[in-house]
């Protein structure tokens, strides 16, 4: 990783997962160690992401375990890269009227999608569900993200930095809190409200503002309602 990683100044140090969702299923975007990007029906260590907001709605997305940036080539294929290229690895984030998020390449205009087709983003368009994303807090115990390299000597602070180059596994305060009116807590399994209805156990939890800084409606997204 370059020392000037754009992620190190992230406004929110927490891990999140981006997932697509229909009424009955959900896929979490995951970036594998080899750079392959696909979806999983559940949170995995490879779907734990950091999202850093930049100016003008741009975001940088990184897989914590793969240590790769989410990038897009000129054909619209998404992949994980150790090298941060501002042209290929920054995405424009936009929230649709339905509360879902879309990400597209300002360079190539294609949408980030878990579907195989490559579609250009057009303002006002209604993208397919596999190109619309929601976000969830990480629910995987942080211990699963620790993969220390065996050492003969006592572990030093340097070893810690090797295991966690992005400094995301140490709790960090969110700089801009969400509005007080916006509950950031996950509904409990015993919650009987319609919002807790989640027969597949894949979409539990409210929308969280992964791109901290919003104070208006953008800072407090609706719950996704699934049957």
């Amino acid at each position: 990783y370059p020392n000037a990683s754009p992620l190190l100044g992230s406004s929110w140090g927490g891990l999140i997962h981006l997932y697509t969702a229909t009424a009955r299923n959900s896929y979490h975007l995951q970036i594998h160690k080899n750079g392959h990007v696909d979806g999983a029906p559940h949170q995995t260590i490879y779907s734990a992401l950091m999202i850093r907001s930049e100016d003008a709605g741009f975001v940088v997305i990184t897989g914590v375990m793969s240590r790769r940036y989410l990038c897009m080539d000129f054909r619209g294929n998404i992949f994980g890269s150790h090298y941060f290229d501002p042209e290929n690895c920054r995405f424009q984030h936009q929230t649709l009227e339905n509360g879902y998020d879309v990400y597209h390449s300002p360079q190539y205009h294609f949408l980030v999608s878990l579907g195989r087709a490559k579609r250009a983003f057009l303002p006002g368009m209604n993208p397919p569900p596999y190109s619309q994303f929601l976000s969830r807090r990480n629910e995987i115990p942080l211990i699963h993200f620790n993969t220390p390299i065996p050492r003969r000597h006592t572990r030093s602070a340097e070893d810690d930095s090797e295991r966690d180059p992005l400094n995301v596994l140490k709790p960090r305060a969110r700089m801009t809190p969400a509005p007080a009116s916006c509950s950031q807590e996950l509904p409990s399994a015993e919650d009987n409200s319609p919002m807790a209805s989640d027969p597949l156990g894949v979409v539990r939890g409210g929308r969280v503002n992964t791109h901290a800084g919003g104070t208006g409606p953008e800072g407090c997204r609706p719950f996704a309602k699934f049957i």
Epitope: T22, N25, H42
Partner: antibody, heavy 117, light 106 residues
Framework: QVQLVQSGAEVKKPGASVKVSCKAS????????MHWVRQAPGQGLEWMGI????????SNAQKFQGRVTMTRDTSTSTVYMELSSLRSEDTAVYYC??????????WGQGTMVTVSS | AIQLTQSPSSLSASVGDRVTITCRAS??????LVWYQQKPGKAPKLLIY???SLESGVPSRFSGSGSGTDFTLTISSLQPEDFATYYC????????FGPGTKVDIK
């Protein structure tokens, strides 16, 4: 290569239950939802339900609520669909199909279930 | 729930003909539409995903188009092995199938 191999044909009496299996191979079983679809003789395709392979959670079409039970065994990469209180109109070919985000990309060969007294 | 209607329900055609099948959704489904081909006694086979993307290994004479509510499957030059039943399916909200279109020999 991806393969979904289903159990053999069954003949059942009305009121009985049937359990059909679908063994997956050639991919990471827990990375894809599995669906069940049925087709009555001479009729179209009817979606029955979906199972999350990692959690085992399911969601069924309203028509089958209370009668269909889907389970999975991750150790053998197998999903099961049990249909209870069988009636003659349940006579059909039952298919499992793998979900690939934007399509059902692989299907089992089908299991014929005949309900007859 | 979103309803899908297909037309025609059946058609007779000859080898070499251009065949067009339409699928209409009761509400907008973006491009989340899939086409399958099914032959008697066989499982459905994926032809087109995301309304217009050809599945790997499917002959290029098959093509899909449309977005929103109206979709089309076209076979540019019908071959003997193409006589089958064709189903559309929406993945926008649930996983409903259309009623099917049977293509038989004239």
């Amino acid at each position: 290569q991806v393969q979904l191999v289903q159990s053999g044909a069954e003949v059942k009496k009305p009121g009985a239950s049937v359990k059909v299996s679908c063994k997956a191979s050639g991919y990471t079983f827990t990375n894809h939802y599995m669906h069940w679809v049925r087709q009555a003789p001479g009729q179209g395709l009817e979606w029955m339900g979906i199972i999350n392979p990692i959690s085992g959670s399911t969601s069924n079409a309203q028509k089958f609520q209370g009668r269909v039970t889907m389970t999975r065994d991750t150790s053998t990469s197998t999903v099961y669909m049990e249909l209870s209180s069988l009636r003659s109109e349940d006579t059909a070919v039952y298919y499992c199909a793998r979900d690939y985000v934007d399509a059902f990309d692989f299907w089992g060969q089908g299991t014929m279930v005949t309900v007859s007294s | 729930a979103i309803q899908l209607t297909q037309s025609p329900s059946s058609l007779s055609a000859s080898v070499g003909d251009r065949v067009t099948i339409t699928c209409r959704a009761s509400q907008g489904i973006s491009s989340a539409l899939v086409w399958y081909q099914q032959k008697p006694g066989k499982a459905p086979k994926l032809l087109i995903y995301d309304a217009s993307s050809l599945e790997s290994g499917v002959p290029s004479r098959f093509s899909g188009s449309g977005s929103g509510t109206d979709f089309t499957l076209t076979i540019s030059s019908l071959q003997p092995e193409d006589f089958a039943t064709y189903y559309c399916q929406q993945l926008y909200d649930d996983f409903d199938f259309g009623p099917g279109t049977k293509v038989d020999i004239k």
